[in-house]
Interface confidence: low
Amino acid sequence: ESALITQQDLAPQQRVAPQQKRSSPSEGLCPPGHHISEDGRDCISCKYGQDYSTHWNDLLFCLRCTRCDSGEVELSPCTTTRNTVCQCEEGTFREEDSPEMCRKCRTGCPRGMVKVGDCTPWSDIECVHKES
């Protein structure tokens, strides 16, 4: 029964880690910003700017940070708990059905239509039929 509770059993915030980058898993899972070690004994911090994890997990590796493509601007950098947020440059937008690339917004509406919405990083200009 003395085996019930050891240093290994303490909640992550209760342990004095040998290095700041390690803590023990809780319920077999590691917190956001960490991945689990191969032997399941430690939670290892993701590398800032290189990889990340957003949820409690038992990943053996953190997820690789996204690099913004040319034609995109970096809205916020990759942290250990959040992926890079990229946004299409001004004058371009990302369509829901082809999210892998930014497309140029149209410069104007077809004849007989009027513009009711501007070009945004997530939508083309919006055109509606002119009322006759």
Partner: antibody, heavy 121, light 118 residues
Framework: EVQLVESGGGLVKPGGSLRLSCAAS????????MHWVRQAPGKGLEWVAG????????YYADSVKGRFTISRDNAKNSLYLQMNSLRAEDTAVYYC??????????????WGQGTLVTVSS | QPVLHQPPAMSSALGTTIRLTCTLR?????????VYWYQQRPGHPPRFLLR?????????GPQVPPRFSGSKDVARNRGYLSISELQPEDEAMYYC???????????FGSGTQLTVLS
């Protein structure tokens, strides 16, 4: 539906050996930690051994250390318990149980029906 | 003295609420541990009921109704299992397990036999 079915129990003489098996189905066996827990007649639950998802890490109760070996074959969706140098006090129903995580916790979410091991001369 | 102590038997009437206790030996602090509860009906394998660490960190077992709930009293170093609207099928042995939010060795309490009086 998660199912765990133990087999291999029976009557064995003190000092003898027995190998228990647990056939798992209804879930991705290779991603869960697994345990053996036993219950002597009329007594409470006693954790025996645990193994992580890959089989790389094995843990034992002090009462069985050096005599019992836990193992798994992920290709066959099977968990095993090799029991050597059996003693009368090892007489119990042996349950196979799934851990809710890849590793080992106290959260054993699914249990088999158990297999009875009787050690007697 | 065992690490986990449970009273051997408790009873309550049909339709009432009962609270089962699991006391952690006082050289350990329940504040940093989860409390796990298992139910075992006669002739059946154990069944995981719930895990309780805090109001915001808890989990219910598969198909376990909300009549079963967990709590902790840090001052008294105790974990509790509350069962409301007691039913005949709640008559069973209840085991707690504690500590080790990531521990690999596993110790159960000695169990409490619950009798439901009709």
């Amino acid at each position: 539906e998660v199912q765990l079915v133990e087999s291999g129990g029976g009557l064995v003489k003190p000092g003898g050996s027995l190998r228990l098996s647990c056939a798992a189905s209804g879930f991705t066996f290779s991603t869960y930690g697994m345990h053996w827990v036993r219950q002597a007649p009329g007594k409470g639950l006693e954790w025996v051994a645990g193994i992580n998802y890959s089989g790389n890490n094995k843990y034992y109760a002090d009462s069985v250390k050096g005599r019992f070996t836990i193992s798994r074959d992920n290709a066959k969706n099977s968990l095993y318990l090799q029991m050597n140098s059996l003693r009368a006090e090892d007489t119990a129903v042996y349950y196979c149980a799934r851990d809710h995580s890849t590793w080992l916790s106290r959260h054993l979410d699914y249990w088999g029906q158990g297999t009875l091991v009787t050690v007697s001369s | 003295q065992p690490v986990l102590h449970q009273p051997p038997a408790m009873s309550s009437a049909l339709g009432t609420t009962i609270r089962l206790t699991c006391t952690l030996r006082n050289d350990h602090d329940i504040g940093v541990y989860s409390v796990y509860w298992y139910q075992q009906r006669p002739g059946h394998p154990p069944r995981f009921l719930l895990r309780y660490f805090s109001q915001s960190d808890k989990s219910q077992g598969p198909q376990v109704p909300p009549r079963f709930s967990g709590s902790k009293d840090v001052a008294r170093n105790r974990g509790y299992l509350s069962i409301s609207e007691l039913q005949p099928e709640d008559e069973a042995m209840y085991y707690c397990a504690m500590g080790a939010r990531s521990s690999v060795t596993h110790v159960f309490g000695s169990g409490t036999q619950l009798t439901v009086l009709s």
